[in-house]
Interface confidence: low
Amino acid sequence: SAPGEDEECGRVRDFVAKLANNTHQHVFDDLRGSVSLSWVGDSTGVILVLTTFHVPLVIMTFGQSKLYRSEDYGKNFKDITDLINNTFIRTEFGMAIGPENSGKVVLTAEVSGGSRGGRIFRSSDFAKNFVQTDLPFHPLTQMMYSPQNSDYLLALSTENGLWVSKNFGGKWEEIHKAVCLAKWGSDNTIFFTTYANGSCKADLGALELWRTSDLGKSFKTIGVKIYSFGLGGRFLFASVMADKDTTRRIHVSTDQGDTWSMAQLPSVGQEQFYSILAANDDMVFMHVDEPGDTGFGTIFTSDDRGIVYSKSLDRHLYTTTGGETDFTNVTSLRGVYITSVLSEDNSIQTMITFDQGGRWTHLRKPENSECDATAKNKNECSLHIHASYSISQKLNVPMAPLSEPNAVGIVIAHGSVGDAISVMVPDVYISDDGGYSWTKMLEGPHYYTILDSGGIIVAIEHSSRPINVIKFSTDEGQCWQTYTFTRDPIYFTGLASEPGARSMNISIWGFTESFLTSQWVSYTIDFKDILERNCEEKDYTIWLAHSTDPEDYEDGCILGYKEQFLRLRKSSVCQNGRDYVVTKQPSICLCSLEDFLCDFGYYRPENDSKCVEQPELKGHDLEFCLYGREEHLTTNGYRKIPGDKCQGGVNPVREVKDLKKKCTSNFLSPEKQNSKSN
C-alpha cells in the first residue's frame, strides 16, 4: 500500500494549527432538500448556492428555495434570496452561468400553472443584483449562452418554439416554430432541427436541419431527412436517413453545413446509434453501435476532414443511446484516452491509448499491487479503471477518473487489479506520467480533488457514516496527512473546488442531523499556509512526456513531436500559484509509418504498421464522394494523422483528383432534393 504517516513520509510542519486558522464553517438556515453550487467567473471567488426544499402536500407540492452568495471562495455566505423576491427557483434548470468572466447568471423561476410564460432572474454583475423578467413562453430547456457573446441567449419552449434574446434575456423573439434541438455553433450561428408534420418523435429521420447566422433574421435549410445532429470541434455531423430503407449514415461538414460529405462509416439501423466521443479541431472519435442489444460498438478515428475513418477499438462498451460509456479524455497529457471494452466472456476491461486512438493497450499493473481474484495468472494482470459505467451500476465508486490540464501527467481513478473490472470495493490509484505507470494511492473508495495545479491533492473517504477527517498530500499522492476539520462529524455529500484546479480552497459539503432537523453545512479550508512560499526555479524538474525508452532518439514522439515539461518536484512544498502556466518545450520528430493512418480503401492488419489494400477494393479505382463531387484517389495507402507535426523521414505519396462528376452521397443539400408536396 502507499506510504502513510510513517517513517517514509515527512510531516508538513504545524499543519494542524495552520489549517485550523483557515477552516471556515457555514451553517445554512435551511431544512435539507437539495443543494446546488455554481462558480461565477474565474478567480473571482464568487459562489452561488441554491437550496431547494419540497414539501409534498395532499394535492400539490409546496416548494421553497434559498439563494446564497459567497465572494471569498466559500468561507462566508450571505442569504440573497430577497434579490430574487423570495421566488422558488427550478432546480432542473440549474443556474445558467455565463461563459468566460462575463459575470452573467440566469435563474429560472417556478411559475403558477395558468401563467402565459415563465420567469427568469438575470444578473450581469456576478450575482450582486438581479432583474426579474417575465418570459413570453414557458422554457423547456435551460437558457443557452452563445459562446461568442454572452448577451445572446437561446431557449426552447414547451411548445417547441426556438426563442432568442439579443440583450441577455431582456427581450425575447421566437425565431422558429416546431424545433426539436438547437445548438450554438461558432460565430453566433444557431443550428437546429425542425419537424414539418407531427412532432419531433414522429418526424425523427424526416427532420430538417436549419442554420441561422443572424439570430433568426434569415435561415438556410442545410439538411433534410435528418435523424439527429451534433457539433464537435470544427465538425458538424448529421445522421441522415438513407433513401431506400430505415438505415442512416453520418454526413459531415466543415463549412457550417454549406457542403457535406458522407463519412466512410458503417450505416446503422433503427436500434443502433452513433456517438461523438470526443472531437477537437483536428479529428473526431466516433462510436458506432453494433447491431442488436450488445452494449458495445466500435470506435473509429477520423482524418482531418472527418470523412475517412480508421477502426480504432473493437467491442467498445457503450450501453445505449445516451447511456453509459467509460470513454475519458485524459486532459493532463496530450493524446491519452481511457475507456472500457466488453470482452467475449462479458467481463469489462480497461484500455488506454497514448497516441489519440492509434493503438490501445491494457493499463500496466501498479508495482505496489497484487492481482485480484479475476486474474488467471497471479503475476500477470492489469489495472482496470472504474468510470461512468461502474457508477451507473451502483458499485462503490464515488467518482469518475480525474485529470486537469494544468496538473501535467496526473491521473487519479478508482480501480482494481486483475484481468477485468471487479465488483469488489475498489482502491484509488494515481499516475504521474499520464497513464503509463500507476501506484495505489489510497485504500478503499474516496472523493478526491486537485488543488494548486497539482501541488496539493485532497481526499475524503467514501463512507455511509458521518465524517470529520480530510486527507491531503503535497507530493502527488505518495504521502498523506489527515486533518480533523470539525469535532462534530457530518454526513458528507460532496467536495467543491473552483474549476481549473488553480485554487487552494476546498469546500466540504454535508448535513448535520439532529432529532428534529437536518441542516446544510459547509467547511471551507484554505491550504495557502501549508504551501508557505511561492515555488522557484529550483522546485521544478524537466520531464519528457511519453518517454518509454530514453536510449531511443525518437523517445517521447507522439503525433510527430515530443514535449518536455517543467514539473514540480514531489519533494517541493510550495505554491504554484493562481497564475501558474504550464511550461513546455516541443520538438519535431521525423515521420515514420506510425504518423500516418490508413487511407480510404486500406487497413492495418493487427500488430503491423503497414497499411494494406482492402481485399474487396483490390484492383478497383478508388473513388469516393467529397462535397458532392466524385473524387479519384491515387494513394499508396497512407494519410497523415490529424494534428501530427512530423517532418522528413517516411513520406508516402498521396494525390486526390477531382473527377468532375456529381455523386449521390450528398443526401443533405436541399438543392439536391426534389421537394415533395406536403
Epitope: 408534420n197 433568426g216 434569415s218
Partner: antibody, heavy 122, light 107 residues
Framework: EVQLVQSGAEVKKPGESLKISCKGS????????IGWVRQMPGKGLEWMGI????????RYSPSFQGQVTISADKSISTAYLQWSSLKASDTAMYYC???????????????WGQGTLVTVSS | EIVLTQSPDFQSVTPKEKVTITCRAS??????LHWYQQKPDQSPKLLIK???QSFSGVPSRFSGSGSGTDFTLTINSLEAEDAAAYYC?????????FGPGTKVDIK
C-alpha cells in the same frame, strides 16, 4: 391532398365590413403558416401578412397593418381576412396560400387557394 | 423592407426559344427567393423554391439560379403553355415581398 378552399366572391359598398375565409384540408392545419396575397385588377402580387394557426401568431406587411385583420379558427381549420370598413381601393382578388413547411415565416407559398374576388363599389 | 425588381417587364418569345428572367433584391437575401407562374384567371403556382430547387411536378425546362441579390429564372425551351406572368418572392425577412412580375407571351 393539400387543399385550400376560399369563400365565394363578394360585392360590397364602401364603409361595409367583410370577412372572407380559407379552409385548409389534407394536412395538419395548425402546423403551417398561411398567408394572404392581394392582386389588384391587372396588377402584380402583394404580400399582406401571415398567420400561424397553432397559436394565432400573425405578421403583417406595414402597408396592410391596421387596414385588415388576419385570424384563424383551428377547430374548423379555417383562416380569415377581414375589413371593418371597406374602401373602393380594396377591390381585388385575394388569395390565401400555405407555406412550404411548418416553420417560422420562412419558405415559399407551396399551395394556393382559388382566390376570392372582392368588389367594393358604391 | 426588401424591394425586388424584375426585368424585363414583358417579353414576347417564339416557341422553343430560351427565356431568362432576372430578379434583383435591394439587399442580400441568401437563397431565400422563390418563383411563381400565374396564368390568366388562375391562382399562382410555385415553380422554384430557394433560388434553385425545382418544385415537384414542374417541367424540367424551368430552372433557377443565383444567391445574394441576383437571381435568374430560365425557361430552356419555351412551350405555348408557358405564356404567363412570372413573379419572384423573397422570404428572407419580414415583410415578405413579391417582385412586380414579368409577363411572357408567345409570338
Amino acid at each position: 391532398e393539400v387543399q385550400l378552399v376560399q369563400s365565394g366572391a363578394e360585392v360590397k359598398k364602401p364603409g361595409e365590413s367583410l370577412k372572407i375565409s380559407c379552409k385548409g384540408s389534407g394536412y395538419i392545419f395548425t402546423s403551417f403558416w398561411i398567408g394572404w396575397v392581394r392582386q389588384m385588377p391587372g396588377k402584380g402580387l402583394e404580400w399582406m401578412g401571415i398567420i400561424y394557426p397553432g397559436d394565432s401568431d400573425t405578421r403583417y406587411s406595414p402597408s396592410f397593418q391596421g387596414q385588415v385583420t388576419i385570424s384563424a379558427d383551428k377547430s374548423i381549420s379555417t383562416a380569415y381576412l377581414q375589413w371593418s370598413s371597406l374602401k373602393a381601393s380594396d377591390t381585388a382578388m385575394y388569395y390565401c396560400a400555405r407555406h412550404s413547411r411548418g416553420s417560422f415565416w420562412y419558405g415559399a407559398f407551396q399551395h394556393w387557394g382559388q382566390g376570392t374576388l372582392v368588389t367594393v363599389s358604391s | 423592407e426588401i424591394v425586388l425588381t424584375q426585368s424585363p417587364d414583358f417579353q414576347s418569345v417564339t416557341p422553343k426559344e430560351k427565356v431568362t428572367i432576372t430578379c434583383r433584391a435591394s439587399q442580400s437575401i441568401g437563397s431565400s427567393l422563390h418563383w411563381y407562374q400565374q396564368k390568366p384567371d388562375q391562382s399562382p403556382k410555385l415553380l422554384i423554391k430557394y433560388a434553385s430547387q425545382s418544385f415537384s411536378g414542374v417541367p424540367s425546362r424551368f430552372s433557377g439560379s443565383g444567391s445574394g441579390t441576383d437571381f435568374t429564372l430560365t425557361i430552356n425551351s419555351l412551350e405555348a403553355e408557358d405564356a404567363a406572368a412570372y413573379y419572384c418572392h423573397q422570404s428572407s425577412s419580414l415583410p415578405h415581398t413579391f417582385g412586380p412580375g414579368t409577363k411572357v407571351d408567345i409570338k
